[in-house]
C-alpha cells in the first residue's frame, strides 16, 4: 500500500496472507471457514495461508495449508477479466475475534462510496519496502466512465476502480487479491494498476465482487 497507514489492530479479521514458503505472495479474504477469496492471477500449486494477525510472519498466527484452488473459468491471462479465485483450505479455520469471515455484498456500491483497501504489499515503488504490519488506505469508488478515461479498453465490465484524485495512495506489488471493503461489505479484490505504483490519478483496479457472488456461492457449494 502506497501512502497508507497502519491498520487499526484487529480491524480486518478477514484479511489473510497467501504465502509462498515464508514469503508474501498475495493477499486474500476469508469468506467461510474453509474458503479464501483472492485474485486469479495469484494462482499457485499450493498455498500457506496466514490468518488472525496483522503482522506478516507472526508465529502466533494460524497457518493453514491449501492445496486446491478454483480460478473463475472465464479468467483471461491476456485481458485479466474475471480475476477472481477461491482457495479451499485443507482444514477449517478456528474462528475468533481475530479471525472472521467478511460479509459478501448484497448490492454493488455506487461511485463516490468511501472504502478501505488493505495489504502487506510494498509501501514504496519502484524500489520495494515490504512492511511487517498490515497497511490500509482509504479510497473512493470511481465510475467506469471516469476510469475508462485513464485505462481505455483495458478496463473490463467487471473491473472496479478506486482512488483519491491527485493522491498517490494506492495498492502495489503484494497487495493483489486483498480486500476493498465498503460499508462493511467486500466490494473489490486488488487486481492491477500502473507501475511505478502511486502515480496520482492512475486509479487502482479491482475485481468487482458484487458481480461474482453467485459464482462464489456455487463454487463453494460444489466443492464442499
Amino acid at each position: 500500500i502506497i501512502d497508507g497507514y497502519k491498520c487499526k489492530e484487529g480491524s480486518h479479521p478477514w484479511q489473510v496472507a497467501l504465502l509462498k514458503g515464508n514469503q508474501l505472495h498475495c493477499g486474500g479474504v476469508l469468506v467461510d471457514k474453509y474458503w479464501v477469496l483472492t485474485a486469479a492471477h495469484c494462482k499457485m500449486g499450493q498455498y500457506q495461508v496466514q490468518l488472525g494477525s496483522d503482522k506478516i510472519g507472526d508465529q502466533s498466527a494460524q497457518k493453514i495449508k491449501a492445496t486446491k484452488s478454483f480460478r473463475h473459468p472465464g479468467y483471461s491471462t491476456k485481458t485479466h477479466v474475471n480475476d477472481i479465485m477461491l482457495v479451499r483450505l485443507d482444514e477449517p479455520v478456528k474462528m475468533s475475534s481475530k479471525v472472521e469471515a467478511v460479509q459478501l455484498p448484497e448490492h454493488c456500491e455506487p461511485p463516490g462510496t468511501s472504502c478501505t483497501v488493505s495489504g502487506w504489499g510494498t509501501t514504496t515503488s519502484p524500489d520495494v519496502t515490504f512492511p511487517s504490519d498490515l497497511m490500509c488506505s482509504d479510497v473512493k469508488l470511481i465510475s467506469s466512465r471516469e476510469c475508462k478515461k485513464v485505462y481505455k479498453d483495458l478496463l473490463g465490465k467487471t473491473m472496479l476502480c478506486a482512488g483519491i484524485p491527485d493522491s498517490k495512495t494506492n495498492t502495489c506489488n503484494g497487495d493483489s487479491g486483498g480486500p476493498l471493503v465498503c460499508n462493511d461489505t467486500l466490494q473489490g479484490l486488488v487486481s492491477w494498476g500502473t507501475y511505478p505504483c502511486g502515480q496520482p490519478n492512475d486509479p487502482g483496479v479491482y475485481t468487482q465482487v458484487c458481480k461474482y457472488k453467485r459464482w462464489v456461492m456455487e463454487t463453494m457449494k460444489t466443492h464442499r
Epitope: H41, K78, H80, L154, N173, V190, S191, G193
Partner: antibody
C-alpha cells in the same frame, strides 16, 4: 549494477540448434519482479522479440517462432538460456538478452520494458 | 497481433532542432508504450516507459506523450549524441511483444 552477458557459438549450421546463454551478474535472476527476455536483430533490420521467462519459469514465446524456441532458467548459475531449433539463414542476427521491468503490478505485471540489455552476440547460420 | 507503425522511417536534422517521431498502434494499448534509442553496434537503451515516464539517467530533453493508439517521442533540442535509431515497443496483449520498424535520425 546489474549486467547481462550473452555467450554461445557465433556460427551454426543450417538445420542445427542454436544455443545461447545469458549470464546475469550484479543481481539475482530469482527476483520475482522481473522477466528475462531474448530479442534478436537481423543485419540492417529492426528488433524482434523471441520470448521471455519469469520467476515461476513460465515462458512466453513469439508465435512466429514458438514451435522452434525453448527458453529456460538456471537460478543456481544465475543464467537463462535460449535454444532455437532447425535454424536457417533467416535466423542470422545479433541476439540480445535483456531484463524486462514491469510497467504494471498485480495482473498487469506482464507489461514491461527492457531496462537492462546485454551487448549482443552475433550468430551466423551458414554451412 | 498488434502492429506498431513508426513515422518517419528516417529524418535529417541539425543540432538544436526539435525532433518529433510518431508511433501508431493498430489497436488501443492504453499508455503501455516504451521508446528505445539504439546506436550502431550497440544494444538498445530504454528512454521512455509507459508512454511518458522518463527512464532514470535519460536527459530531460527527451519526452513522450500519447495514449490509446497514437504516441509521440520528442527531442526538444537535438544534441550530437542523439543521432541514432529510435524504436517504439508495445507491451500489453503479448505474445507477441512488438516493436515499431524504427526511425533513423541523421545529421543534416
Amino acid at each position: 549494477q546489474l549486467q547481462l552477458q550473452e555467450s554461445g557459438p557465433g556460427l551454426v549450421k543450417p538445420s542445427e540448434t542454436l544455443s545461447l546463454t545469458c549470464t546475469v551478474s550484479g543481481g539475482s535472476i530469482s527476483s520475482d519482479d522481473y522477466y528475462w527476455v531474448w530479442i534478436r536483430q537481423p543485419p540492417g533490420k529492426g528488433l524482434e522479440w523471441i520470448g521471455s521467462i519469469d520467476y515461476f519459469a513460465s515462458t512466453y514465446y513469439n508465435p512466429s517462432l514458438k514451435s522452434r524456441v525453448t527458453i529456460s532458467v538456471d537460478t543456481s548459475k544465475n543464467q537463462f538460456s535460449l535454444k532455437l531449433s532447425s535454424v536457417t539463414a533467416a535466423d542470422t542476427a545479433v541476439y540480445y538478452c535483456a531484463r524486462g521491468r514491469p510497467l504494471g503490478y498485480g495482473a498487469r505485471h506482464d507489461y514491461y520494458g527492457m531496462d537492462v540489455w546485454g551487448q549482443g552476440t552475433t550468430v551466423t547460420v551458414s554451412s | 497481433d498488434i502492429q506498431m507503425t513508426q513515422s518517419p522511417s528516417s529524418l535529417s536534422a541539425s543540432v538544436g532542432d526539435r525532433v518529433t517521431i510518431t508511433c501508431r498502434a493498430s489497436q488501443s494499448i492504453s499508455s503501455y508504450l516504451n521508446w528505445y534509442q539504439q546506436k550502431p553496434g550497440k544494444a538498445p537503451k530504454l528512454l521512455i516507459y509507459s508512454a511518458s515516464s522518463l527512464q532514470s539517467g535519460v536527459p530531460s530533453r527527451f519526452s513522450g506523450s500519447g495514449s490509446g493508439t497514437d504516441f509521440t517521442l520528442t527531442i526538444s533540442s537535438l544534441q550530437p549524441e542523439d543521432f541514432a535509431t529510435y524504436y517504439c515497443q508495445q507491451s500489453p496483449y503479448f505474445p507477441p511483444l512488438t516493436f515499431g520498424g524504427g526511425t533513423k535520425v541523421e545529421i543534416k
